[in-house]
């Protein structure tokens, strides 16, 4: 990172660890300039899966990541990808440090550390940066909802965050759908919660100088009865090359026995929708599953004709739920560029 008055004339900082994740803390308002490896050609920067434009306040330009003046919304995960092979050259998380303070000359120098930006950072035990975002301690949500617990913190050295459920280390391996740990947001996200998710969730934030913790209570209110609950984000948008095999996943939670159908949207006489307003679909697969199982649609040796929209439709005695995803099928020569492109997936969620 380089603090600069004139962005155009300043060199950029090369990655410290190529192909490994790096976390950098940036002061509010500080300019950022990062170069991607030792060459400017054929390198593209992405933020949270979206390619950065070559112009603007935050831009990917000539293989460089440039931020004119760092703002809170600039925090997040950045990838630099080599265009030909789509190799991840640089995997970087930028965090905003809102703990910078001016240092007087008479402070103990042993409590200070310096950064590559020239700033001097006080060593500091972890502390909550936004306690007002943690005010809601008691959570009671209906089954199927998404729950997000946040423990935004800072410190120097940068603290780590770990999550506990009912006092035990929690990684979500035993819950359907798992969990999402978004370390740059200091958050734990659980989608499609079910009664077994009830409990006390504790964030433990620590560095070499100390630790802090905070607990949330989660109660899940059973919708009894309710239509099937589909795992958020499934099926997922998928890109495949001609001749490859594809799996589309649908995770279903239902108290009542669910009935599952996989549908492919088709075009008839140039139209995707019938006179009744419903889409034209072809039923690919029908099955009954138990409440916590995963339903998979296997597509073997895909061709260009397999591209399109697929829907997982789950019904029980109470109602229907369905979610859709797009399958993109590419010719073989396009594989190297597209398959690893971190595009932000968009999903369609429907309930009836």
């Amino acid at each position: 990172l380089e603090a600069s008055e004139e962005m155009e004339q300043e060199p950029c900082l090369a990655p410290i660890l190529e192909q490994q994740e790096q976390v950098l803390t940036v002061a509010l308002g500080q300019p950022v300039r990062l170069c991607c490896g030792r060459t400017e050609r054929g390198r593209h920067w992405y933020k949270e899966g979206s390619r950065l434009a070559s112009a603007g306040r935050v831009r990917g330009w000539r293989g460089r990541l440039e931020i004119a003046s760092f703002l809170p919304e600039d925090a997040g995960r950045y990838l630099c990808l080599a265009r030909g092979s789509m190799t991840v050259v640089h995997n970087l998380t930028l965090l905003m440090d809102d703990s910078l303070t001016s240092i007087s000359n008479d402070e103990d120098p042993k409590t200070l550390s310096s950064s590559s930006s020239g700033h001097v950072y006080p060593q500091q035990a972890p502390y909550w940066t936004h306690p007002q975002r943690m005010e809601k301690k008691l959570h009671a949500v209906p089954a199927g909802n998404t729950v997000k617990f946040r423990c935004p913190a800072a410190g120097n050295p940068m603290p780590t965050i770990h999550w506990l459920k009912d006092g035990q280390a929690f990684h979500g391996e035993n819950r359907i759908g798992g969990i999402r740990l978004r370390h740059q947001h200091w958050s734990l996200v659980m989608e499609s919660v079910v009664p077994s998710d009830r409990g006390t969730y504790t964030c433990l934030v620590e560095n070499s100088l100390g630790s802090i913790r905070y607990s949330y209570l989660l109660d899940v209110l059973e919708r009894s009865p309710h239509r099937p609950i589909l795992q958020a984000g499934l099926p997922a948008n998928t890109t495949a090359v001609v001749g490859s095999d594809v799996e589309l996943l649908c995770k279903v939670y239902s108290d009542a026995q669910p009935h599952i159908q996989w549908l492919k949207h088709v075009v008839i006489n140039g139209s995707s929708f019938g006179a009744d307003g419903f889409p034209y679909v072809q039923v690919l697969k029908t099955t009954d599953i138990n409440s916590s199982e995963v339903e998979v649609l296997y597509l073997r040796n895909v061709s260009a004709e397999d591209a399109g929209e697929y829907t997982c439709l789950a019904g029980n005695s109470i109602g229907l739920s369905y979610q859709s995803a797009w399958l993109t099928v590419l010719p073989e020569e396009d594989l190297t560029w597209t398959t690893a492109t971190p595009e932000a997936a968009s999903h369609h969620h429907h309930h009836h």
Partner: antibody, heavy 118, light 107 residues
Framework: EVQLLESGGGLVQPGGSLRLSCAAS????????MKWVRQAPGKGLEWVSW????????EYADSVKGRFTISRDNSKNTLYLQMNSLRAEDTAVYYC???????????WGQGTLVTVSS | DIQMTQSPSSLSLSPGERATLSCRAS??????LGWYQQKPGQAPRLLIY???TRATGIPARFTGSGSGTEFSLTISSLQSEDYAIYYC?????????FGQGTRLEIK
Amino acid sequence: EVQLLESGGGLVQPGGSLRLSCAASGFTFSRYFMKWVRQAPGKGLEWVSWISPSGGLTEYADSVKGRFTISRDNSKNTLYLQMNSLRAEDTAVYYCARASYGAWLDYWGQGTLVTVSS
Amino acid sequence: DIQMTQSPSSLSLSPGERATLSCRASQSINRNLGWYQQKPGQAPRLLIYGASTRATGIPARFTGSGSGTEFSLTISSLQSEDYAIYYCQQYDNWPIIFGQGTRLEIK
């Protein structure tokens, strides 16, 4: 208007049992965590137990664990505290209280007196 | 468990005077602290939550402040109806703990 009305208190011998009730009105009872807090004569406030909206989560103070059971009937808008193996030190006014989303207690009942004495 | 210590245990002041009650936590509770008022023969009433936010219907003369481990409740000009026992309560971590109370008496 939020109202909490406790009942079921009285005089009981050591080792005996009582069941306290708290009738709630004026809010959607089934969405709130509820708590029992007690106050011994001339003493301060002591948390006894809490229960989550579904009833699926409960917790107890160490002093009553294994002897008291908290429960609720959302269809009747009623909170309960079953007290077994009562001791003299359980003598207190028992309050039911509604916990706001942040865990502070925003509404309290008027209390019911439990006296454990031989 | 977190310990909550209130001081003074009792306070005698005249109407119109300013009262300052203190509450100390044995470890940081951020701003997760409430203040309650209890009059003889009545249930406690919530005054302040989040260390400084007045509950519904609480007069502006009641002010809460502090964070971390040190908190205070200030009554700017005592009224006759303010004489009572005041309790602080932490809800940062389980179990929720109340202070032992400060008795505010008429001088």
